[in-house]
Structure formats: C-alpha cells, structure tokens
C-alpha cells in the first residue's frame, strides 16, 4: 500500500552530485574497447587514469620457453570505478586483460561484495586473438537493475596457479525512498503523548522526512530519517502518514488510524437459556469494545415484585464466555437482568434489561405430624400426616413421596410409594414380618421432592402378636422418634 | 541558549523601503522555519507568511502578496523580511518567530517597531 | 480559512478568582496553542498542543477543549497573569490565531 510520486520540482538539494572519479547516468556504460556485433552502447568511456602504473593484484609471469625475455605483469586494465544509476534501468560494465598466448584455459570469474556469482547471470566472455597476446573483455549486464544489485563487483581470473584481481567496479541503484520502519495502527488513551516512527534509505540519501496528521503537514521543514513523531495526545481518531523524499523523489508511507480508547458499547441481545427453581443462565452479546480489550462484566439482577426493597445484586464475572449463571435466586420469582462490561477505560452503560422468572422450587418444609400404626387385619401399615405450611415460591403441591424401609435380621429393603395431593393418609402393606418398618414423608411440587420428616419406627411383629399402639413424629423439643409397640 | 535577535526600530517614509533581520542562535538554523507576524498598534496577532530555511522557499499569506519578501542569509543564520512602498497601514510591530511541529511557535524575537510618517 | 474568536474580549477578575476564557473555530481543529502577551513584549508560548504546559507556566493555569470549542482557565488568578492571551489552531493552513482575550486585575 505505499504509493510513489516523483517530484518534478525538487526544491531541496539532496544529493551532492557524482563524486570523483564516478560516472552518474541512467545510461549503459562500457569500456571504450571491442565489443560484440549488434550491441551499439549509449555512451562509452575511458579507462580513467590510462597511464597509472597498476599496483594491485598481478601475476608475474615466468621466462617464457625461449628463455631470453620476461614478459610484463599481468594485470586487469583500469575501469570505470563507480557507476551510479536508477532503479529499472538496464547496466553493461566490463573488466579486460591483455594475455600472452603461451597461457591456455584462461577462465575470467565475476564476484560481487566477495561471492562467486553462478548461475543465471549474463556474464559474456570475448576473447580477441593477436600475433602474441590475446585480449579478454568480460561483460556482465544487468537488465532492470534492483537495489539488491547494489555493491561491488570484481574479475578474477586465475593463470598458473596465481589469482589475478580486477579494480571493484561500485554499482549504485538510486530510487525513491524505501522504508525500513513506517507508523503502526494504534488505539492510544484520550490526550496522552505518544510516538509514532518512520525510517526510510535511499540511496541516494539523504532521506527526509514529512510527517502528515488527517492531511495537514505536522512538519513544513524536512526531517531526517529515522524521524520519531511525539504526537502531543488526541481527542479523536486521527490518520496519520509519512513522506519520505530524496533526490529522486518522494515515496508516502500507509496511513495508519490512531483510535482514541473509550468505556463500550453496552452489550445487547441479552438472552435467557435456562431457569431453575433457584438459578437462570444467561447469555449476551458484548459490544464495541472502544479499542480497549474487556476485563470483566457484571450481571445485574433486580427482584421485580412491588414488596421488595428493589436492592440490586451485583454478580462480577469474567469478560468471556459470554455467559453467566445467575444463583441464589428465590423460586417462582420474577427478575430483571441487565449487563454491563468493562475496558481500561470504565464501564459500559447496562445493557436493555429483561424479564426472566425462576422455576417452581421444591418444598423447604417436611410434612408434620406423621402417625404409624399397624392393621393386622389387613396386614397393612396405616400412615396420616398434616400438609406442610409450604410456600408460595414452592409451587403447587402435586403429592407426596413416602419412604418405607423394612429391616429384620441383617437384610434392609427401601420402598417409594407416590401419593396424590388431595391424600393426608396413605396404607402401605407389610413387607416382612417380624421387622422393623421406618417411615418418612416428603411433599412434591413440580419444582422437585422436598425434605423427608424425621423417620418413624414400628415393629412389626410375627404373626398374631399385634399391639395397635401408633408410633408418631415426636412432639416439638422431643429428641428422638417414639417407638411403640 | 536559543534565541531569535531582531534589528532595531525604524522610521520610514511612505513609499520606502525597509528590511528587518531576525538572527537565530542555539539551534541548527536550517531546522526550523521562521515565521512572520505582524502586531499594528493596540491590535492582535496577524500571521504574514514563512520562509523555509532549508530550501529557502517563501509563503506568504493572502494579505502579505505583493510588497513583502522573505529572505535568507543561511551562513550568518539570519532570516530577512523587506517590506516595499511603505504605506500608513504597514505601521506595526513585526515579530519572527522559530516554528516546530503542529505550527508552535516557541521562540520568538522581541519584535521590530516600523513607523510610517510623512 | 478557519476563523477563531475569543472571548470574552475583556476579562476583569479579582486576585484569587477563577477565570476561564474560550477559543471558538467556525470549523473543527486537531490542536489550539496560547501564548501570553504583556504590553511593550513579544508574545509568549503559554500553552502547546491543546493542554500541555510550557516551560516555566504556573501550574495554576490548564487548558482543555476539543473540535472547535477550546478554553483556557486560571484556577486562582494572581497579579502577574494579567496580559492578553491569544489562542492558534492548528488544524487546517492557514494556522491563523484568534483575536485575543485581555486579563485585567481588579
């Protein structure tokens, strides 16, 4: 996303012209020497400095086979130092050497910054025979040059044993300014300092930088890169970006929106997923979040009855799942929820409140006054009972549960019998003989089975030994259940 | 310590010429922008336009196009503002002053009084 | 242009007192800077980037304000503070100043 303009007029004189001894061109460069048929170069040059005696890297060749002379030095012939270009443009440089004809298999290498180039590189080597020597022109060319192609390049070629090594030729693709480092997306706290930073490279350099805030120039005068920006704080969201321009141009970074954190979005869509005698689960959606991250929520739940003291209570829970399970509510109650979630910054407004009821609950109470007695004419145990002052949370009573175990000789046995609502009295038929039969009484309304009453014993004798004395609950204040026989 | 020193008063005739000069010390001149404001007697604060210090360039605003200019003198880290064809309503005091981001002008000089009399 | 007008033009208060003096723009800005005037000075960098204080400005002087209502106050005015203070947006080019307001102490 970075856009690229070039300036026509460049009123800042960023770059200090070709230095010495270096070519500035967006033109192929070539020696001034033979070249292949069909390659014509735009421009041509010199050796610089032909008449420099060459002190670098050369070989020393033996006497030759007649034994009467030595041959010069071998050594790579002067070029262009420094060749300095535009980015896309194509480049052609070259390195020669002159070699006596006794020397055979003569193999000139490229090297760029100290590595071998192989492989898919356009290097051509041109040899041109003479009476003695043979003249070598290496040419490597560079279509559409890219900054990676920056750096130095050398000839090497190895002749009996010895390494000789040309003068570096230094490639420099100039372009528009490429950032390093461009300003990031970031929600900030309300009127806080903070910084934004932008770094862009060259070459050429220098690189300066301009920064720009929702279309208005921060900077009117360049700075340099890298360019850090203390932004003195904002009241809202603000876009910013940065130029970066040089010698050939300017390059603009992405904009980048700095959001201001403020409290959320209420949530919405709060919904009831389950109610119980005593609880209720919730769900909700949560809203914006004001470019904070949610820490937590509260659920808030009001008793919706005209003789509550309309106390709210207050369940904190964390930011996610989005859900909660709402205890400790009383059966058979109507209730209004509403939820309410946090940030770094504060809390939300509530969300909508809505209505939810609890379930039915289940008895809080046993039932009283519970009376056995054995009638052995009809070999059934007779059981009566009062209903149980239940309340209204509780729901409608539907019946009750009756426990009976029967225990004689080591071998225990529990029996459930159901009654209906409209019964204070159930018969039950003895189970064993010579046993003792322990009864307890629960009432039931559709929010579940309440607490059983305190257990009541009666022996049940073997047959014809029958006392009808009734065993009963014990009187309030009594410590155990009576047993009667 | 960063200061902008302005040149002295000056009593002009109508349709003269007179030119002000604004040195910085403290900083690297070419840094910042210098700025120019105009005060007429008994009146507030009115922006007339800045120089570039790095390019050299000019902007003036609306009112000041025409009979101002803005200069440099880079290697003495003076800032110059030439007022041509003086004219009664040119009569004020000028201040320079050192502009930093968001437009803050946070050095200014301690103003130039020009009289315009006949 | 984006206009800014102060107010009100003529502020008299007591040593002591609490004053609050406003920067309207017709059009909303990022940014308002003061600057304090005496008569016979240069002005002064007062307040910069809409509520941070410049070097040396008593801490009995804040700023505040957003989009295009701006006000600086002074919690307990002091002989000293009284000069013009003039408030500059930045927001949009030209970045013009406002009229001013004149602090005067009773």
């Known amino acids: 996303a970075i856009t690229e303009a070039r300036e026509e007029a460049k009123p800042y004189p960023l770059f200090p012209g070709p230095l010495p001894g270096s070519l500035q061109t967006d033109h192929t460069s070539l020696l001034s020497l033979p070249h292949t048929s069909g390659y014509q170069p735009a421009l041509m040059f010199s050796p610089t400095q032909p008449g420099r005696p060459y002190t670098g890297n050369v070989a020393i060749p033996r006497v030759t086979s007649a034994g009467s002379k030595l041959l010069p030095p071998l050594a790579f012939k002067h070029t262009v130092g420094h060749i300095i270009l535009s980015e896309h443009k194509d480049v052609k440089f070259n390195c020669s050497i002159s070699v006596p004809n006794i020397y055979q298999d003569t193999t000139i290498s490229w090297w760029k910054d100290g590595k071998e180039l192989l492989g898919a590189h356009h290097a051509i080597t041109q040899f041109y025979p003479d009476d003695e020597v043979t003249a070598i022109i290496a040419s490597f060319s560079i279509t559409s040059v890219q900054r990676s192609d920056n750096g130095s390049y050398i000839c090497k070629m190895k002749i009996n044993n010895e390494e000789i090594v040309s003068d570096p030729i230094y490639i420099e693709v100039q372009g528009l300014p490429h950032f390093t480092k461009q300003p990031e997306s970031m929600n900030v706290t309300r009127n806080t300092a903070f910084n934004l930073t932008c770094q862009a490279v060259g070459p050429p350099e220098p690189v300066n930088i301009f920064w720009v805030q929702n279309s208005s120039r921060v900077n009117e005068q360049p700075e340099k890169s890298p360019s850090v920006l203390t932004v003195p704080g904002l009241t809202e969201m603000a876009v910013f970006s940065c130029e970066a321009h040089n010698d050939k141009g300017l390059t603009v970074s992405k904009g980048v929106q700095i959001n201001i954190k403020a409290i959320p979005s209420p949530p919405t869509e709060v919904s009831i997923h389950n109610s119980t005698a005593h609880s209720i689960l919730i769900s909700w959606v949560p809203g914006f979040d004001g470019y904070s991250p949610f820490r937590n929520c509260s659920v808030q739940v009001k008793e919706v009855d005209p003789l509550s003291n309309g106390s709210v209570m207050i369940f904190n829970t964390s930011a996610s799942p989005h859900m909660y399970q709402i205890k400790q509510l009383q059966a058979l109650a109507n209730y209004s929820i509403g939820v309410s979630c946090m940030n770094e910054i504060g809390w939300s407004a509530v969300s909508p409140w809505i209505l939810a009821s609890t379930t039915e609950g289940a008895p809080s109470v046993a039932p009283l006054n519970v009376t056995v007695f054995l009638n052995e004419s009809r070999d059934n145990v007779d059981i009566r009972w009062m209903k149980p002052l239940t309340k209204r949370q509780a729901g409608e009573l539907v019946g009750y549960r009756i426990s009976h175990v029967w225990q004689s000789a080591g071998i225990s046995k529990e029996l459930l019998e159901e009654v209906g609502q409209n019964n204070s009295r159930a018969q039950i038929s003895v189970q064993v003989h010579n046993a003792t039969c322990t009864v307890r009484i629960a009432a039931v309304t559709k929010g579940g089975v309440g607490p059983f009453s305190d257990p009541v014993k009666i022996f049940i004798p073997a047959h014809g030994w029958v006392d009808h004395a009734p065993s009963s609950t014990p009187a309030p204040g009594n410590a155990d259940p009576v047993l009667i026989i | 310590q960063i200061q902008l020193v302005q040149s002295g008063p000056e009593l002009k005739q109508p349709g003269e010429t007179v030119k002000i000069s604004c040195k910085a010390s403290?900083?690297?001149?070419?840094?910042?922008?210098v700025n120019w404001v105009k005060q007429a007697p008994g009146k507030g604060l009115k922006w007339m336009g800045w120089i570039n210090t790095y390019s050299g360039e000019p902007t003036y605003a609306g009112d000041f196009k025409g009979r101002f200019a803005f200069s440099l003198e880079s290697s003495a880290s003076t800032a110059f503002l030439q007022i041509n064809n003086l004219k009664n309503e040119d009569m004020a005091t000028y201040f320079c002053a050192r502009r930093v981001r968001y437009w803050y002008f946070d050095v200014w000089g301690a103003g130039t009084s020009v009289t315009v009399s006949s | 242009q984006i206009v800014l007008s102060q107010s009100p033009a003529i502020l008299s208060a007591s040593p002591g007192e609490r004053v609050t003096m406003t920067c309207r723009a017709n059009?909303?800005?990022?940014?308002m800077h003061w600057y304090q005037q005496k008569p016979g000075s240069s002005p002064k960098p007062w307040i910069y980037?809409?509520?941070n204080l410049a070097s040396g400005v008593p801490a009995r002087f804040s700023a505040s304000g957003s989009g295009t209502s701006y006000s600086l106050t002074v919690s307990r005015v002091e002989a000293e503070d009284a000069a013009t203070y003039y408030c500059?947006?930045?927001?949009?080019?030209?970045?013009?100043f406002g009229s001013g307001t004149k602090l005067e102490i009773k």
């Open positions: 059009s909303s800005v990022s940014y």
């Open positions: 500059q947006q930045w927001g949009s080019n030209p970045f013009t």
């Open positions: 403290g900083y690297t001149f070419t840094d910042y922008g």
């Open positions: 980037a809409t509520s």
